[in-house]
Interface confidence: low
């Protein structure tokens, strides 16, 4: 099973129980010798190819438990036949072995008698048969091949013998490793439960962080939802408030400029009139009547009409009315109202925090109580009771094994010694055959007669006969050992080792009422006294092998339902009911009637109806009818063309006066006109489409107000629910994880499965049965081939 997931808990935020490391390996590797064991398994498959007899074994066990067995009963007879049918291959091999055991001593005896009576070979032929050398060669090669086969069998025997010794020596370490793992399981479990409980604080802290930050989490959430509909409107009103201020400033500038222009224009007109009078007076000089001065005077007289100020400057209307209107508009602090609007939004997080203090405290109380509830639930878990009972069992088993291991090691040395003797005996026989062959081949002289043959050749024959003699003497004893070990080893392999690996053995043990006639399921009866509860060896073993927790493996939910006790819905319900009392009242201010009127008044203030063109037209014109500086320089030039005297001097003085008028009167007017131009441009920009703009803002305002009226409560409800879901999500996720961890992860019974594997698969099958089977296979092979060997040797 994977991690439980909760829709509302953050996906990345996963819990993980710290991994428990076990020492004992899951599987046993035989190494290169495994090939030899496989060879034996193939032989056994040939001898015993039938499937594991589940039904037969069940019936057999049921019969075995019966106090008195009636052998005449048909079902007993049928069961016997089934067993015989299943064991046919083994029985056949046993029969052959028994024949070998019975016949070999008899044949040996008769052969011995026969030989003593000089009837069975050993006669010396003077002349060889024609095919004699060929036959001898054939016999020698056959014997050599057979001896090699025997040698391989002996090698198997030695290897098997050595394996038993080395593997049994490893048993102590293997047992210790298993017990260490079982202790780790016992010790780690309380730590795992502690860890699970500790994770509650992590969850609680996360929730507390969100509760403490309710202003930013919930308040911020509400604010984020409202902002897009309100801020743009407030921004527009704010820009309008700025525009009103700019308009006021522009109108004030314009008004003061216009007033200045009125005065400046009057002053300019007055100055120009005065200088014209002076010039006219000067031109009355008698010199003006005399040629060529008269032409100059006439020229000056004609140009006097240009010395006029622009009369339209004084006719530009003031903007008092518009300024009054804007000042009236500014009596309402629109900027302040907008700021209040912003503030009412920005206050949402603080208001949320203030208004939810009690609810938050309530939720915190609930969360703290959930913590103690979980503590109580975990303390009442039956895992500890089972592990305590198991601990006693582990201790007893360990002391039993440590007590009996020396005995096992002692028996092992007897076995090893016995095996060594058997293998050595066979080795001796085969050595005699090899020596016989070697001496025979080396000492052979084709020209020598039987009486004159050499010592080496003769010794070869002796060696062969000694081999034959020893074969007759011991092979039947060896065959007895082979048969016994074969029957035991083959049946254990076929009825325990193979079905254990394929789990068929568990299926037999899981047969209802088999191991105890009162219990349907033995394990549940033994563990919980509830034999109806389906708890099978196969399922428990498989679950343990998969590293599943004890709670889930042993179906402890039947005696203590963690889901019921944790009661996720009740806890989340408690949080939900606290969250339901979370009420937030918001008062979002959006301008109000005063603000609306303010905008409408501004739209009606008249700046959009002003005749800007008339003002702009004047800003492009010269304040006087002519460029006074040019006029003054021209007048000076004309005066210089006159002869020195009063006329020339008075004209020059007037020219200087005109320059002064330009400096003191015209330049300030030009400055004022520039200011007027800028003010008019600002007003023109503001006034352009003002009514439409205000209408649009008011429409947006209505929309925003409607949104607030109709949606604020639903936004608050939605965000509160979302906030609640987040808080609840943390705990749902945590509680689901607890349920998952306790069921699937805590007190993982893997070491139990490993211990069982160690006892059956490793110790019994790999350490004992595999070498035992290899032993009888090797020795059996060697012993069987002693028969053809002795025939060929003779």
């Amino acid at each position: 099973g994977g991690q439980p997931s909760s829709t509302d808990a953050p996906k990345a935020w996963n819990y993980e129980l710290p991994a428990t490391n076990y020492e004992t390996q899951d599987s046993h590797k035989a190494g290169p010798i495994g090939i030899l064991f496989e060879l034996v398994h193939i032989f056994l498959y040939v001898v015993q190819p039938r499937d594991f007899p589940e039904d037969t074994l069940r019936k057999f066990l049921q019969k075995a438990y019966e106090s008195k067995i009636d052998y005449d009963k048909p079902e007993t007879v049928i069961l016997g036949l089934k067993i015989v049918y299943y064991e046919a291959g083994i029985i056949l091999c046993c029969v052959l072995g028994l024949l070998f055991i019975i016949l070999m001593p008899l044949v040996g005896y008769f052969f011995c008698m026969c030989r003593c009576c000089n009837k069975c070979g050993g006669e010396m032929h003077q002349r060889q048969k024609e095919n004699g050398p060929f036959l001898r060669k054939c016999f020698a090669i056959s014997l050599l091949v057979i001896c090699i086969i025997i040698s391989i069998g002996i090698f198997y025997g030695f290897v098997a013998n050595h394996q038993v010794r080395t593997r049994i020596k490893r048993s102590r370490k293997l047992a210790d490793s298993n017990f260490k793992d079982l202790r780790t399981l016992l010790n780690e479990t309380p730590e795992q439960i502690k860890y699970i409980l500790a994770q509650y604080n992590t969850t609680k802290d996360k929730a507390f962080t969100d509760l403490n930050s309710i202003n930013s989490v919930l308040g911020g959430g509400i604010l984020d939802r409202l902002r897009p509909n309100i801020i743009p409107v407030l921004d527009e009103i704010k820009s309008m408030a700025t525009a009103i201020k700019e308009t006021k400033e522009a109108l004030e500038n314009m008004n003061s400029t216009l007033k200045s222009l009125h005065q400046q224009s009057t002053q300019l007109s007055s100055s120009l009139t005065s200088v014209k009078t002076s010039l006219r007076s000067s031109l009355n000089d008698p010199l003006c009547l005399v040629h060529p001065s008269s032409e100059t005077c006439n020229s000056i007289r004609l140009s006097l009409s240009q010395l006029n100020s622009n009369p339209e400057l004084r006719q530009l209307p003031p903007v008092d009315a518009e300024l009054d209107n804007v000042n009236n508009v500014l009596r309402t602090d629109l900027d302040g109202l907008v700021q209040q609007g912003y503030q009412s939004l920005n206050d949402i997080p603080d208001r949320v925090q203030r208004q939810t203090t009690t609810v938050v405290a309530g939720i915190k109380r609930v969360l703290n109580s959930i913590g103690s509830d979980i503590d109580n639930v975990t303390q009442r878990l039956p895992i500890q009771d089972i592990l305590s009972a198991f601990s006693v069992y582990v201790n007893n088993t360990e002391s039993y094994i440590h007590r009996n291991l020396p005995t096992l090691e002692e028996y092992d040395s007897y076995w090893w010694l016995g095996g060594l003797v058997i293998c050595s005996l066979l080795t001796l026989i085969v050595i005699f055959y090899y020596l016989g062959l070697l001496c025979g081949v080396c000492g052979y002289d084709r020209h020598a007669t039987p009486t004159t043959r050499g010592c080496v050749s003769n010794t070869g024959g002796v060696f062969l006969m000694v081999g034959v003699g020893l074969s007759f003497l011991f092979c039947w004893i060896l065959m007895i050992i082979v048969v016994l070990t074969f029957v035991f080893g083959a049946n254990v392999e076929k009825l325990i080792c193979e079905p254990y690996t394929s789990k068929e053995l568990f299926r037999v043990l899981d047969t209802p009422y088999l191991l105890n006639e009162d219990w349907e399921y033995y394990l549940s009866g033994k563990l919980f006294n509830k034999s109806k509860m389906k708890l099978t060896f196969e399922q428990v073993y498989s679950d343990c092998k998969k590293n599943r927790g004890t709670y889930g493996t042993l179906h402890l939910q039947n005696s203590f339902n963690i889901s019921e006790h944790l009661n996720i819905n009740e806890h989340t319900g408690s949080i939900s009911s606290e969250l339901e009392s979370l009420k937030v009242n918001l008062n979002i201010f959006l301008l109000g009637a005063a603000g609306r009127k303010n905008l409408q008044d501004f739209a009606a203030c008249g700046i959009d109806r002003m005749n800007y063109d008339s003002y702009l037209a004047q800003t492009g014109k010269s304040p006087a009818g002519v460029n006074l500086l040019s006029f003054a320089y021209d007048l000076e030039a004309k005066a210089n063309s006159l002869p020195p005297g009063n006329l020339r001097n008075s004209l020059k003085r007037d020219a200087q006066t005109i320059k002064t008028i330009h400096q003191q009167r015209v330049l300030p007017i030009e400055q004022s006109l520039s200011t007027l131009y800028q003010s008019v441009k600002i007003l023109q920009r503001t006034g352009n489409g003002l009514l439409e703009r205000v209408t649009r803002i008011l429409a947006s305002l209505d929309f925003a107000q409607n949104f607030i009226t109709n949606n604020t409560s639903s936004v608050i409800i939605e965000e509160t629910k979302k906030y609640g879901r987040t808080i609840i999500g943390y705990f749902e996720h945590y509680l689901q994880w607890i349920e998952f961890s306790i069921s699937e992860k805590v007190a993982s019974c893997k070491p139990v499965a490993t211990a069982l594997d160690t006892a059956v698969d490793v110790f019994l099958c790999s350490y004992i049965i595999d070498p035992l089977n290899l032993f009888w296979f090797g020795i059996g092979k060697a012993t069987v081939f002693l028969l053809p060997a002795l025939i060929f040797a003779v």
Partner: antibody
């Protein structure tokens, strides 16, 4: 039972500093905000600001920005009001109060501060 | 800031009479709260959320109103009710109190 106990009356000279304490009991201190309210002799109540007891963050009313400082000692369930550079017009009774949403439900007995040269 | 105007500033009543204290807000508020303060004591909450009676407060106190106009009624008034009464809003930040109404008993 919820109780807010303030420190005793204070007599100070202008320019000095005073620190008034408010010890809370009977509830989880960090569950409720702490507010400070002042009352000049014969005058009405004036809200000075509040303290977020969860985060320790203070907020001050416009009239009480600058010389006034709120602080807390969570482990002792105590809030503090410190006034620096005392002036004669700081003479008043200072109350601490906890709030429930929009109103003040529990009040301290008040600390009378007299500033006189 | 929202300004709360209480009227009258001082009033006098005889035991058994009905006393009405008004509180007017400069702009609309959703909720109003009323406090009683006796000399040398801190204020005591009487009414919350316009009309809800705080536990331990006698039933002769009641509150009403909406928008900008709110009232506190005491009927029948008793000797022990002589105190200053304050209205308070927290509808708009910052919270503000009324100037207070001093109730004297004849």
């Amino acid at each position: 039972e919820v109780k807010l106990v303030e420190s005793g009356p204070e007599l100070k000279k202008p320019g000095e500093t005073v620190k008034i304490s408010c010890k809370a009991s009977g509830y989880t201190f960090t569950d409720y905000s702490m507010h400070w309210v002042n009352q000049a002799p014969g005058k009405g109540l004036k809200w000075m600001g509040w303290l977020n007891t969860e985060t320790g963050e203070p907020s001050y009313a416009d009239d009480f920005k600058g010389r006034f400082a709120f602080s807390l000692e969570t482990s002792a369930s105590t809030a503090y009001l410190q006034i620096n550079n005392l002036k004669n017009e700081d003479t008043a009774t200072y109350f601490c109060a906890t709030d429930y949403g929009d109103y003040f439900d529990y009040w301290g007995q008040g600390t009378t501060l007299t500033v006189s040269s | 800031d929202i300004v709360l105007t209480q009227s009258p500033a001082i009033m006098s009543a005889s035991p058994g009479e009905k006393v009405t204290i008004s509180c007017s807000a400069s702009s609309s508020v959703s909720y109003m709260y009323w406090y009683q303060q006796k000399p040398g004591q801190p204020p005591r909450l009487l009414i919350y959320l316009v009309s809800n009676l705080e536990s331990g407060v006698p039933a002769r106190f009641s509150g009403s109103g909406s928008g900008t106009d709110f009232t506190l009624n005491i009927h029948p008034v008793e000797e022990e009710d002589a105190a200053t009464y304050y209205c308070q809003q927290y509808h708009s930040y910052p919270p503000t109190f009324g100037a207070g109404t001093k109730l004297e008993l004849k």
